[in-house]
Interface confidence: low
């Protein structure tokens, strides 16, 4: 069952799925000047059995110079339905853990892929949030959102995260006052 909506937006934060439930689809998008090969699948699909999950199909992009060098491939209407976007990142790894059963890892990049990946998430998917650089994460609870089915409709739970700038006071009891970083910005636990 596909999730109807996008995960919640948090000001000054981005989200990322780090493992993808079976049934998740990833559009085969190409960067400007390239298009999906004619015989290529429009999406990759996370499938699996009881012991192993992997992405079916492979995305392939070819130069569209022969046709229209500025045209960027856009999904067909059925591909656009319930499209989900996440920031393109390097492959995620769950620290020192085995793969999650029933989940696929982030697919490796393919040649000439678009800068943004468009996912179609399924019920049960979890996405994780982090503050953008220069903002500090304050937590009331999990910085994550889960797509759930309730009364026949899908919804994303609300991540309990606030990303605050250096001038904003802490709102959370039990939290230590932030120490200024050398460049004067508040340090964020997700900044590197």
């Amino acid at each position: 069952e596909l999730c109807d909506d996008d995960p919640p937006k948090i000001t000054h934060a981005t989200f990322k799925a780090v493992a993808y439930k079976e049934g998740t689809m990833l559009n085969c998008e190409c960067k400007r000047g390239f298009r999906r090969i004619k015989s290529g699948s429009p999406y990759m699909l996370c499938t699996g059995n009881s012991s192993h999950s992997s992405w079916d199909n492979q995305c392939q992009c070819t130069s569209s110079a022969a046709r229209n060098t500025t045209k960027q491939v856009t999904p067909q209407p059925e591909e656009q339905k319930e499209r989900k976007t996440t920031e393109m990142q390097s492959q995620m790894q769950l620290a020192d853990q085995v793969s999650l059963p029933g989940h696929c890892r982030e697919p490796p990049p393919w040649e000439n892929e678009a800068t943004e990946r468009i996912y179609h998430f399924v019920v049960g998917q979890t996405v994780y949030y982090q503050c953008v650089q220069g903002y500090r994460a304050l937590h009331r609870g999990p910085a994550e959102s889960v797509c759930k089915m309730t009364h026949g409709k899908t919804r994303w739970t609300q991540p309990q995260l606030i990303c605050t700038g250096e001038t904003e006071p802490s709102q959370f009891p039990g939290e230590e006052e932030p120490q200024a970083s050398p460049d004067g910005l508040p340090e964020s636990e997700t900044s590197r």
């Epitope: 790894q93 853990q97 999990p142 739970t157 039990g174 230590e176 636990e189």
Partner: antibody, heavy 130, light 107 residues
Framework: QVQLVQSGGGVVQPGRSLRLSCAAS????????IHWVRQAPGKGLEWVAV????????YYADSVKGRFTISRDNSKNTLYLQMNSLRAEDTAVYYC???????????????????????WGQGTTVTVSS | EIVLTQSPATLSLSPGERATLSCRAS??????LAWYQQKPGQAPRLLIY???NRATGIPARFSGSGSGTDFTLTISSLEPEDFAVYYC?????????FGQGTKVEIK
């Protein structure tokens, strides 16, 4: 193998200080938030503090805020708990425990211990008594 | 803070029997609940995370269920090594809190 080895407990008088250490090995220390959890004699578990993987964010239980300081030295794979102004009610076995985050080569996503506290230290006893 | 109440305080059972432990939260914690096992003189051990997911290396006889405010840890058939104290813990709100524990003892 994956382990957290604790040290630094002992008997101390009320009002005095003590520092606990928790040395990590067998895993990538910087991919984990680390907690301190304590257990008074014959009682249940009480969460004390947590520090984010790079040491920037620290949270405390109200019962220890202002008296205890959690810190970590990622170059030494070691976690610390500096306990000042100790009270009789701080008497307990103190455990350090790790919680994994999802990490890339560039950063960790603050999933807030999605997998629970999956590896614990052996515990160290702190007795506050006059 | 969220209060977790475990019941019963003590459960007296024989090896091979089924154990059902309850954890009730003072307000909804969604599915953000973990279960730990602790034996005398040892550190706690993670059994279940997020209400129903078995941690790495945990035998299939341990299962968790529930969401919102009511949760259950079930041990389908008690082994001698399962007699211990069990704690639930929520991560839905700061601060993280534990239940007071349920002791599973040999009858």
């Amino acid at each position: 193998q994956v382990q957290l080895v604790q040290s630094g407990g002992g008997v101390v008088q009320p009002g005095r200080s003590l520092r606990l250490s928790c040395a990590a090995s067998g895993f990538t220390f910087t991919n984990y938030a680390i907690h301190w959890v304590r257990q008074a004699p014959g009682k249940g578990l009480e969460w004390v503090a947590v520090i984010w993987s790079d040491g920037d964010n620290k949270y405390y239980a109200d019962s220890v805020k202002g008296r205890f300081t959690i810190s970590r030295d990622n170059s030494k794979n070691t976690l610390y708990l500096q306990m000042n102004s100790l009270r009789a009610e701080d008497t307990a076995v103190y455990y350090c425990a790790r919680t994994p985050w999802y990490c890339t080569s560039t950063n960790c996503y603050t999933g807030y211990y999605y997998y629970g506290m999956d590896v614990w230290g052996q515990g160290t006893t702190v007795t506050v008594s006059s | 803070e969220i209060v977790l109440t475990q019941s019963p305080a003590t459960l007296s059972l024989s090896p091979g029997e089924r154990a059902t432990l309850s954890c009730r939260a003072s307000q909804s914690v969604s599915s953000y609940l973990a279960w730990y096992q602790q034996k005398p003189g040892q550190a706690p051990r993670l059994l279940i995370y997020d209400a129903s997911n078995r941690a790495t290396g945990i035998p299939a006889r341990f299962s968790g269920s529930g969401s919102g405010t009511d949760f259950t840890l079930t041990i389908s058939s008690l082994e001698p090594e399962d007699f211990a104290v069990y704690y639930c813990q929520q991560r839905s709100n700061w601060p993280p809190t534990f239940g007071q524990g349920t002791k599973v003892e040999i009858k």
